[in-house]
């Protein structure tokens, strides 16, 4: 009774297409698969960034897999062939592992890379990234930003840098077509006459860094003697109403402060017969149904009403 064996995949490698962290893991079928012609072999692939505790595991019948990685660190991957039990009249047979690693040889010391990288997608329309130069770098150092997301055929360089004293400290991006809900990859590298500069890699999804405009058209109506309805409109722009969450700050007679979060553009407030004046401000953020994270907008302009005036209007109506 001969033991069934299978070889590992051949030519296993990690290929960097220049997409700033989106890599291809690819391989060839193992040698001597002739005995298993009627059988579709599978491959178990494990990969991770070096330093990560956990492996991502994929089982596929294809000869490649694509995923995003953090190029600030190295990447390690391993793969073996699986012969399903249907092919062996018994239990699953696994080959030994084939292994591959990939890393970008770092230039310069870590301190030379950009500091405090910050990216905001204003009103889901305009992406702006800013950074500070590395520690101890001279004024001859300049940084360049490159970006890629699925849909672009190559990484693009920023064409509209924000400069201070001739040094690039940020980038205003052009219109980014079909760029949300997918990984957005950025590399900021640098050049200097005096010393090599370390590159930095960043990955995020645009819908998670949106800072909306503040709500507009704040109004206030008295629904009944002790009920006041606050209303506002969604900010102008491409963000649909269903994607907003709001925070309201209400001040009664310069004393009581109420902060509350609501999911639509109205809020009904109970007041006492002592209330003379009512002021409120609202700010907006993209909610959990449209993103995993977000940035609060600035507060709207403060609007104040005399309760007596509101009551008169209500009685007139």
């Amino acid at each position: 009774d001969t033991e069934i064996k299978v070889n590992p995949p051949q030519d296993f490698e990690i290929v960097d297409p220049g997409y700033l962290g989106y890599l291809y893991l690819q391989w060839q079928p193992p040698l001597s698969l002739d005995n298993f012609k009627e059988c579709t072999v599978e491959y178990e692939l494990k990969y991770r960034n070096i330093g990560s505790e956990t492996w991502t595991t994929i089982i596929t019948k294809n000869l490649h897999y694509k995923d995003g990685f953090d190029l600030n660190k190295g990447i390690e991957a391993k793969i073996h062939t699986l012969l399903p039990w249907q092919c062996t009249n018994g239990s699953e047979v696994q080959s030994s592992w084939a292994e591959a690693t990939y890393w970008i040889s770092p230039q310069g010391i870590p301190e030379t890379k950009v500091q405090d990288m910050d990216c905001v997608y204003y009103n889901w329309q305009y992406l702006l990234c800013s950074w500070k130069p590395g520690i101890g770098v001279l004024l001859d150092t300049n940084y360049n930003l490159f970006y890629w997301y699925e849909g672009l055929d190559r990484a693009l360089q920023c064409v509209d840098y924000i400069k201070v004293d001739g040094q690039n400290i940020g980038c205003r991006f052009p219109y980014l077509e079909s760029s949300d809900y997918k990984d957005f990859y950025i590399c900021v590298n640098g050049s200097s006459e005096t010393k090599p500069i370390r590159s930095s890699y960043f990955t995020f999804q645009l819908q998670n860094i949106v800072k909306p405009l503040p709500p507009v058209c704040l109004t206030c109506t008295q629904e009944s003697l002790y009920e006041i309805k606050l209303k506002w409109s969604i900010p102008l722009g491409p963000i649909p109403a269903r994607c907003f969450v709001y925070e309201i700050e209400i001040r009664e007679d310069d004393t009581t402060l109420v902060t509350t979060t609501v999911e639509n553009e109205t809020y009904t407030l109970k007041i006492t017969n002592e209330t003379r004046q009512l002021c409120f401000v609202v700010r907006s953020k993209v909610n959990i149904y449209c993103s995993d994270d977000g940035i609060w907008s600035e507060w709207s302009d403060k609007q104040c009403w005399e309760v007596e005036e509101l009551l008169k209007k209500t009685l007139l109506l």
């Epitope: 290929v15 220049g18 291809y24 690819q26 060839q28 079928p29 000869l63 490649h64 694509k66």
Partner: nanobody, 121 residues
Framework: QVQLQESGGGLVQPGGSLRLSCEVS????????MAWYRQVPGKEREMVAQ???????KYYGSAKGRFTISKDSAKNAVYLQMNSLKPEDTAVYRC???????????????WGQGTQVTVSS
């Protein structure tokens, strides 16, 4: 089902050039990567160059700077332009494609028979 036909091999003097061609025919719905390998008898095959996903081009070993891989998607063909040839480039050059059959769902690897390249004075 899928045939790979190589041509362009032969005897060439050191410093000379050759252009290898590989035409793919048969029932293949998509070609995802195309490569040239070479093998010397008694040694393991080695990858020379490939055009992989996203038209990424990669060269291996001594092929860098001397060889150029290209493809013609309309003809389902891949080429290898070899310049500044050296005696150590002598080998059987085999074309490989990874693609999906019209009747299939998963990638398969297909090989040509190979074409002999001999570099000698």
């Amino acid at each position: 089902q899928v045939q790979l036909q190589e041509s362009g091999g032969g005897l060439v003097q050191p410093g000379g050039s050759l252009r290898l061609s590989c035409e793919v025919s048969g029932s293949i719905s998509s070609i995802n990567r195309m490569a040239w390998y070479r093998q010397v008898p008694g040694k393991e095959r080695e990858m020379v160059a490939q055009i992989t996903y996203g038209d990424t081009i990669k060269y291996y070993g001594s092929a860098k700077g001397r060889f150029t891989i290209s493809k013609d998607s309309a003809k389902n063909a891949v080429y290898l332009q070899m310049n500044s040839l050296k005696p150590e480039d002598t080998a059987v050059y085999r074309c490989n494609i990874v693609g999906v059959l019209t009747t299939g769902h998963y990638e398969n690897s297909f090989w040509g028979q190979g074409t002999q390249v001999t570099v000698s004075s």
